[in-house]
Structures are given as structure tokens and as C-alpha cells.
């Protein structure tokens, strides 16, 4: 299995469903398929109201049964721990993989929690987080924000991932904006080439 590095905003925007949920136990293999499913208890839906229609909640999260097929393995035994799950919808079912953005809710900073609840959605369909994985890299559009965490931090979990969102500054321009108390502060030199 391999996964492309993903900024949390990209994970939010590319997912059909973003929910908060608790895992209720061990996975159950679904016979005659390559999938297994985890029973979950959804506590809040953050994205996907349109996609799910009348569905009141999701009881299961489906994932490939093998790690080589990017199956997700849930390691926590704590059934009261709440997780942020960003997944895909297929045939009315929530699907997740080892590549999904799936983290304990309490591991997110208050600013990140607010971003998943409210802020990231403002950038979906308008702005694009553009990964810079090797120098030189340049922006292909004014609607792109250059994501340099992999180069500067050596990891996809860096300053931009933790503290910034790529949001419209005006109809034709997107810039990195700080996820702190004020959402009006922009990251200096955000449009410069790396």
C-alpha cells in the first residue's frame, strides 16, 4: 500500500464524509469480499449532509481486509475515544483506508478542530493545496497554495498542515491563512516559489 501525502484541508475537501465517531470493537470480515468492517458510533457529522440524504448515521466503516490493499488497522482499544474520520461514500457505505485522514479528535488543536468544523469548507472547490515535494516547484495557478511541509519539515505533518488553510482572499486568489484566533492574517510570501 502507498499513500500520497495529504494536507488536512485536501483530505477534508476530497472526502465525501467527515465525521466524528467512536470505534466499537474489532473488525468483522465480510465473507466473499476483500473487505472488513468496523462498527462505529457516529457522534457528529462535519461534512456529507448532502451526500447521505436521509441517512441518520453510519454504523460501519468499511476497509480492505489486507494492509497491502491499504486496509486501515484500528489500534486503539478505547471505545470512548472519539476519532475524526474523513472517508469516501460508496453504495451508501462509509469507506476508509490506511491513507484516510483518521486521527483522535483530541489530538487536533482547537484551531484544527475549528477548521474541520467550519474553515476548510470555504476552500473546497475554490482553492487547491499544491504539494511541493522537490525543489524547484512553482504554483500553476493563483488558486493554488504551495505546500512545502515535506521539504522544509521532512514530513507532511508540519507548520502549514497544523496551522494554515488555503482560502480565497478574493475571487481569483487563494493564500495561506492562519488558523489561529483571527482568520484574516495571511502567511507572508505564500505565493513565492520554493
Amino acid at each position: 500500500c502507498s499513500c500520497a501525502p495529504t494536507h488536512p484541508q485536501t483530505a477534508f475537501c476530497n472526502s465525501d464524509l467527515v465525521i466524528r465517531a467512536k470505534f466499537m470493537g474489532s473488525p468483522e470480515i465480510i465473507e466473499t469480499t476483500l473487505y472488513q468492517r468496523y462498527e462505529i458510533k457516529m457522534t457528529k457529522m462535519l461534512k456529507g449532509f448532502d451526500a447521505v440524504g436521509n441517512a441518520t448515521g453510519f454504523r460501519f466503516a468499511y476497509t480492505p481486509a489486507m494492509e497491502s490493499l491499504c486496509g486501515y488497522v484500528h489500534k486503539s482499544q478505547n471505545r470512548s475515544e472519539e476519532f475524526l474520520i474523513a472517508g469516501r461514500l460508496r453504495n451508501g457505505n462509509l469507506h476508509i483506508t490506511a491513507c484516510s485522514f483518521l486521527v483522535p479528535w483530541h489530538n487536533l488543536s482547537p484551531a484544527q478542530q475549528k477548521a474541520f468544523v467550519k474553515t476548510y469548507s470555504a476552500g473546497c472547490g475554490v482553492c487547491t493545496v499544491f504539494p511541493c515535494s522537490a525543489i524547484p516547484c512553482k504554483l500553476e495557478s493563483d488558486s493554488h497554495c504551495l505546500w512545502t511541509d515535506q521539504i522544509l519539515m521532512g514530513s507532511e505533518k508540519g507548520y502549514q498542515s497544523d496551522h494554515f488553510a488555503c482560502l480565497p482572499r478574493n475571487p481569483d486568489l487563494c493564500t495561506w491563512q492562519y488558523l489561529g484566533v483571527s482568520m484574516t492574517r495571511s502567511l507572508p510570501l505564500a505565493k513565492a516559489e520554493a
Partner: antibody
């Protein structure tokens, strides 16, 4: 690098049995599904079945269930496709390939060179 | 069950761009399902060209690109070259996770 090397071409008569092989190297053979794909002369690709060599869990396409047997010997990193009684319609090129996951995608990322099976009286 | 439909043949002249379509249904390709594309030269094994929508394995030319709109995935080859003449197959997977191939498209490079 990942390599799948298949056994050589075979010429058989109807009713005979046959077992062809696919040897993997350059990766953890027991951790990935191996699929078998048929291509009849001048036709397209058809998935026959897959096997997980780690525990020999095997799944067949409904079209091939009962027609062939897929097996593996993890000690020598080899997967097999076998027939107990060949028919003329089994004449085809057979490929093995590694079934792989990338994010939400499932695909065949590496292929063997193919084994041509000819069944003729 | 999932079925993928491709045109039997397409053709183009060197330097041109061509597009090969792969059509499914709203329950498979209309969902999140990505499509992979394989190239097969006569007498050779298939080779992965595009995966997860528009990712290329190392060594595959950036003249090859993939896209998806609704129930149809597409493979576009720009700056067509003689060596691009081959059969092309799309592949997705069904709701059980098992692979499904399109019927294949024969690409002819004219002239």
C-alpha cells in the same frame, strides 16, 4: 525491484492436466495478493482469481470457479494455476500480476511475462 | 455488477492528442472509484500506465494522463508517437474489491 517470472509455454492435448507457475521476488511475497489473468487469442483481459500467499486464501471469478485451481507455495515464493482436464478453449496467454492498493484504488502494479498455453489434439 | 465499456478502436496522427473513454455506471465509476489504465503491445504483458485517476508510475511519459467525469474515465495521450500504438485497457474494481477490466481499445497511429 519487484519481479514476477512465469514458467514457459506449454502445448497440451485435450483432457490432460497442467500446472503453470509464477515466482515472485523483490518484495514480501506473502503480504500481497497475486492475481491470474487470461487473454484468449485476439481478445481482452479477464480476471480469473486471486490468492493471498500468506495464508493461501483464494478467491475466484464466477466465470472460472470450478474450472481452474489457484494455489501457492510461500516457501519458494511461487503461485500456481492448474487445470485437471484441459479443453481446446483453454488455449490462451495467462498472466500473473500483483494486486496492490494505492489510497482507495486497487490495481495490478506488476505483471509476469505471460505463459502461453496451447491445447490442441 | 460493474461493467466497463471502451471503444473498440481509436486512431490519430503523430503529434495529435487522442482520448480513450471507459464508461461504467453511477454505482461504480460515478462513485469514488478510480480507474487504472494499462498499455499492451502485441506479444507483451500489460504495463500499468495510470493509476488512482491521474498518477503515473515512474518511467511513464507525462504525455499520458487520466481523468474522470461522472460515470466516464478517460485516458489522454498527447503528442502521439508511433510507439504508442498498442491496446489499452481500463480497470476498476467491484463492490467486493475484485478487479474488472474494460474490453480494450486498439490505438492506431496513422502514417
Amino acid at each position: 525491484q519487484v519481479q514476477l517470472v512465469q514458467s514457459g509455454a506449454e502445448v497440451k492435448k485435450p483432457g490432460e492436466s497442467l500446472k503453470i507457475s509464477c515466482k515472485g521476488s523483490g518484495y514480501s511475497f506473502t503480504s500481497y495478493w497475486i492475481g491470474w489473468v487470461r487473454q484468449m487469442p485476439g481478445k481482452g483481459l479477464e480476471w480469473m482469481g486471486i490468492i493471498y500467499p500468506g495464508d493461501s486464501d483464494t478467491r475466484y471469478s464466477p466465470s472460472f470457479q470450478g474450472q481452474v485451481t489457484i494455489s501457492a507455495d510461500k516457501s519458494i515464493s511461487t503461485a500456481y494455476l492448474q487445470w485437471s482436464s484441459l479443453k481446446a478453449s483453454d488455449t490462451a496467454m495467462y498472466y500473473c500480476a500483483r494486486y496492490y492498493g494505492f489510497e482507495y484504488d486497487l490495481l495490478f502494479d506488476n505483471w509476469g511475462q505471460g505463459t502461453l498455453v496451447t491445447v490442441s489434439s | 455488477d460493474i461493467a466497463l465499456t471502451q471503444p473498440a478502436s481509436v486512431s490519430g496522427s503523430p503529434g495529435q492528442s487522442i482520448t480513450i473513454s471507459c464508461t461504467g455506471t453511477s454505482s461504480d465509476l460515478g462513485g469514488y472509484n478510480y480507474v487504472s489504465w494499462y498499455q499492451q503491445h502485441p506479444g507483451k504483458a500489460p504495463k500499468l500506465m495510470i493509476y488512482a485517476g491521474n498518477n503515473r508510475p515512474s518511467g511513464v511519459s507525462n504525455r499520458f494522463s487520466g481523468s474522470k467525469s461522472g460515470n466516464t474515465a478517460s485516458l489522454t495521450i498527447s503528442g502521439l508517437q508511433a510507439e504508442d500504438e498498442a491496446d489499452y485497457y481500463c480497470q476498476a474494481y467491484d463492490s467486493s474489491g475484485y478487479p474488472v477490466f474494460g474490453g480494450g481499445t486498439k490505438l492506431t497511429v496513422l502514417g
